[in-house]
Interface confidence: medium
């Protein structure tokens, strides 16, 4: 039910600079490339991470077991809930962490139902389909590189490439393509 091929196409020209471990501290990206993505913080998949983590209980804990992927929607329970919880094509957020990407953390939406929830019964109906809404996002991807021209990766050295990826930001309810 996930589409693993969320990666887009690399958009890099020429040979990117090969940064040593000293030039770039772990987890950081080159400032001139960061400038190209100055609005990263405003992108929903990036902004959501900090709000989700701020609301979290920090550190794992026992939590209720959900007995089914597609929830039963009860109006009285969701009046105060967020959009992704009140939707008839509800979704959850998965915080995706990739050390070789900047931003390292992105919030991916995952539809909880194959169908949609019937507003009258609160239960899933197969007469409608939940589909993901995708947003194109520019990210930086780091790759090992050689600083001595030998072609062999230099330990701790990385080059950065820009790349567009498609990030699911939510789900919506649609009519099936065929009945």
């Amino acid at each position: 039910h996930h589409d693993p091929s969320l990666r887009g196409h690399p958009h890099s020209h020429g040979t990117p600079h090969c940064y040593s471990a000293e030039e770039l501290p772990l987890g950081q990206a080159p400032p001139h490339l960061l400038a190209r993505g100055a609005k990263w913080g405003q992108a929903l998949p990036v902004a959501l991470v900090s709000s989700l983590e701020a609301a979290s209980h920090r550190g794992r804990h026992e939590r209720p077991s959900a007995t089914t992927q597609c929830p039963v929607l009860r109006p009285e329970e969701v009046l105060e809930a967020d959009t992704h919880q009140r939707s008839i094509s509800p979704w959850r957020y998965r915080v995706d962490t990739d050390e070789d990407r900047y931003p390292q953390k992105l919030a991916f939406a995952e539809c909880l139902c194959r169908g949609c929830i019937d507003a009258r019964t609160g239960r899933e109906t197969a007469a409608l389909n939940s589909v993901r809404l995708l947003q194109s996002l520019l990210v930086l991807r780091r790759r090992p590189c050689s600083r001595d021209g030998s072609g062999l990766p230099t330990p701790g050295a990385f080059a950065f490439h820009t790349e567009f990826i498609h990030v699911p930001v939510g789900c919506t309810c649609v009519l099936p393509r065929s009945v």
Epitope: S56, R60, R63, S65, P71, Q85, D96, T97, E99
Partner: antibody, heavy 128, light 110 residues
Framework: QVQLVQSGAEVKKPGSSVKVSCKAS????????ISWVRQAPGQGLEWMGT????????YYAQKFQGRVTITADESTSTAYMELSSLRSEDTAVYYC?????????????????????WGQGTLVTVSS | DIALTQPASVSGSPGQSITISCTGT?????????VNWYQQHPGKAPKLMIY???YRPSGVSNRFSGSKSGNTASLTISGLQAEDEADYYC??????????FGGGTKLTVL
């Protein structure tokens, strides 16, 4: 670039304890949890417990509760697993693994662990 | 604790596709818990092949794919190669933060 290097093989007597170390390099030690997984000869993988240095918390499998102690020394980026009251059934290869938690959010948080980097394994033989 | 059930063995010829299943219950695999898959060659440490049901770590061949339907997660290997012969384990985390592995599946490339 992340590497987990474990201590060498051990031969122990029944009733004694063993302490295996796991030194991490190439990443931020406190950013990730370290789990210990064992594998008896010809058997499957069995999770023993996890330490989360950032939150200072440890989680143990019920089977090993009271017998296993997992600790971490952030200054040396090393995690340790000590198993006491050893018996012959504890003969196994013990692995440390970096534990990345995927967290998903609906009405609650749901934690899922995955082990993306593993140590080379430490064979512990318990024999009289 | 949850129990994840895998077939003990699976076999296929080079170039073929094979699927390994991992069955749980509606409160774990069929609920909000993710499933990960590992490959282990004899005498070696396990290697993460698929995480969070269907995502591939960088460096893992796109011949490996994961999916989940109901209470069953599946690992599919297409274009089978000799080096794919290994043990494969599924793994998940239950609601009490207990990590559980399937019993393992031995893949034989004929």
């Amino acid at each position: 670039q992340v590497q987990l290097v474990q201590s060498g093989a051990e031969v122990k007597k029944p009733g004694s304890s063993v302490k295996v170390s796991c030194k991490a390099s190439g990443g931020t030690f406190s950013s990730y949890a370290i789990s210990w997984v064992r594998q008896a000869p010809g058997q499957g993988l069995e999770w023993m417990g996890t330490i989360d240095p950032f939150f200072g918390k440890t989680y143990y499998a019920q089977k090993f509760q009271g017998r296993v102690t997992i600790t971490a020394d952030e200054s040396t980026s090393t995690a340790y697993m000590e198993l006491s009251s050893l018996r012959s059934e504890d003969t196994a290869v013990y692995y440390c693994a970096r534990d990345v938690s995927s967290i998903s959010y609906y009405f609650h948080e749901y934690y899922s662990d995955r082990f993306d980097y593993w140590g080379q394994g430490t064979l512990v033989t318990v024999s009289s | 604790d949850i129990a994840l059930t895998q077939p003990a063995s699976v076999s296929g010829s080079p170039g073929q596709s094979i699927t390994i299943s991992c069955t749980g219950t509606s409160s774990d695999v069929g609920g909000y818990e993710y499933v990960n898959w590992y490959q282990q060659h004899p005498g070696k440490a396990p290697k993460l092949m698929i995480y969070d049901d269907s995502y591939r770590p960088s460096g893992v061949s796109n011949r490996f794919s994961g999916s989940k339907s109901g209470n069953t997660a599946s690992l599919t290997i297409s274009g089978l190669q000799a080096e794919d012969e290994a043990d494969y384990y599924c793994q998940s985390t239950d609601p009490h933060s207990t990590v559980v592995f399937g019993g393992g599946t031995k893949l034989t490339v004929l």
